[in-house]
Amino acid sequence: MAVTACQGLGFVVSLIGIAGIIAATCMDQWSTQDLYNNPVTAVFNYQGLWRSCVRESSGFTECRGYFTLLGLPAMLQAVRALMIVGIVLGAIGLLVSIFALKCIRIGSMEDSAKANMTLTSGIMFIVSGLCAIAGVSVFANMLVTNFWMSTANMYTGMGGMVQTVQTRYTFGAALFVGWVAGGLTLIGGVMMCIACRGLAPEETNYKAVSYHASGHSVAYKPGGFKASTGFGSNTKNKKIYDGGARTEDEVQSYPSKHDYV
């Protein structure tokens, strides 16, 4: 029962985490214009992994995609790669874990197979979470480094030099979403790995024993029984786990140091 709950909870937590990683990857607010101790501007600049946006005081928002691939800095490419790898691994992990759930019956799949699948998905979730955390952390480090590189009329952003007034960027909402989502995916993966240990069947072979009942010459030979896990053909005390994860990801496209184009 505890194993089922752990596995189900791990799945739901990972599902939320991966949804969060996808949301963070798609969000435009990875870095946002630092408003503290800066001149009050009539525009608000913010940037994501795929495009940079400017929201004017009128509410008009204009976004420009980074249409170049070779012109983009290696660090940005690395962050993109880490987030995509995290999403792909997470998606595969989710697919595997669905079939590994104890509450879902697929043919005559043995518990050992389910245990292996649970472990596989757990490892995938852990790696996925680590990828997301690493990607977000690399970007955050990039922001911190660039934040202090400020001179009067020139900046060395992630995309080169432009003669312009210094615009400093700070952590955007996507970074926090990414960190939390990566953490949840990691926790979900650990829970799946823990559940795997409880799922793994222990092979216990009982040797044939002759029971001589008085007045009878009947020998009972039980043979090699597997330790019952409460599932298999025994449907007594079977509980279907219903994990309904609901995520509401609001991706806003509303406001340089990091003009990637």
Partner: antibody, heavy 120, light 113 residues
């Protein structure tokens, strides 16, 4: 047709108060930020204040900060400028101007203006 | 505050000739986020409110004749009237649209020679 009509100007003594109004028509008022800009006699344009669509963002020129209050009533399609502690240097024609939506923050439509005279 | 300086203060040009007004800002009006310049030009005729001519340093507002053009980037901007017409007699103002408080140039009075 976009129209902005200012009213409420007049003669007021130094230290006195006045409330200017700007009635908007011909466009969805609640979709636009509005500015007050003034022009002293024979002088250039001076930006006074700005209020965003939903009144969440308000900015003032340093010369009027603490004395003037900009507000709006989207239900009435109206903009207001409450002026207190008026000084002689506040004498000017006051214009309300619409902040264009996709005009890089430029003011695309202006009212005809209302004259405020601060004199004893 | 951003200081906008226009030159000349007044300008007399013959009908059909080119008129050029310059505007300099104390800080760059180029927003690095979108590589756009936040500078506007206004025309004010006597007894009338200002009228938007150019925004974003070079984009003509709707209904503005194509003889009006804007150019420049960063801190240096220019308004050009390719062939001066009688109705172009007015005072022209440049304006910083990037930083609050929004600031105007002192104005350039354009007259016919």
């Amino acid at each position: 047709e976009v129209q902005l009509v200012e009213s409420g100007g007049g003669l007021v003594q130094p230290g006195g108060s006045l409330r200017l109004s700007c009635a908007a028509s011909g466009f969805t008022f609640s979709d636009y930020g509005i500015h007050w800009v003034r022009q002293a006699p024979g002088k250039g344009l001076e930006w006074v204040a700005y209020i965003s669509r939903g009144s969440s963002t308000i900015y003032y020129a340093d010369t009027v900060k603490g004395r003037f209050t900009i507000s709006r009533d989207n239900a009435k399609n109206s903009l207001y400028l409450q002026m207190t502690s008026l000084r002689a240097e506040d004498t000017a024609v006051y214009y309300c101007a619409r902040g264009g939506y996709d005009t890089r923050n430029a003011m695309d439509y202006w009212g005809q203006g209302t004259t405020v005279t601060v004199s004893s | 505050d951003i200081v906008m300086t226009q030159s000349p203060d007044s300008l007399a040009v013959s009908l059909g000739e080119r008129a050029t007004i310059s505007c300099k800002s104390s800080q760059s009006l180029l927003n690095s986020g979108n590589q756009k310049n936040y500078l506007a030009w206004y025309q004010q005729k006597p007894g009338q409110p200002p009228k938007l001519l150019i925004y974003g340093a070079s984009t003509r507002a709707s209904g503005v004749p194509d003889r009006f053009s804007g150019s420049g980037s960063g801190t240096d901007f220019t308004l050009t009237i390719s062939s001066l017409q009688a109705e172009d007699v007015a005072v022209y103002y440049c304006q910083n649209d990037l930083y609050y408080p929004l600031t105007f140039g002192q104005g350039t009075k354009l007259e016919i020679k």
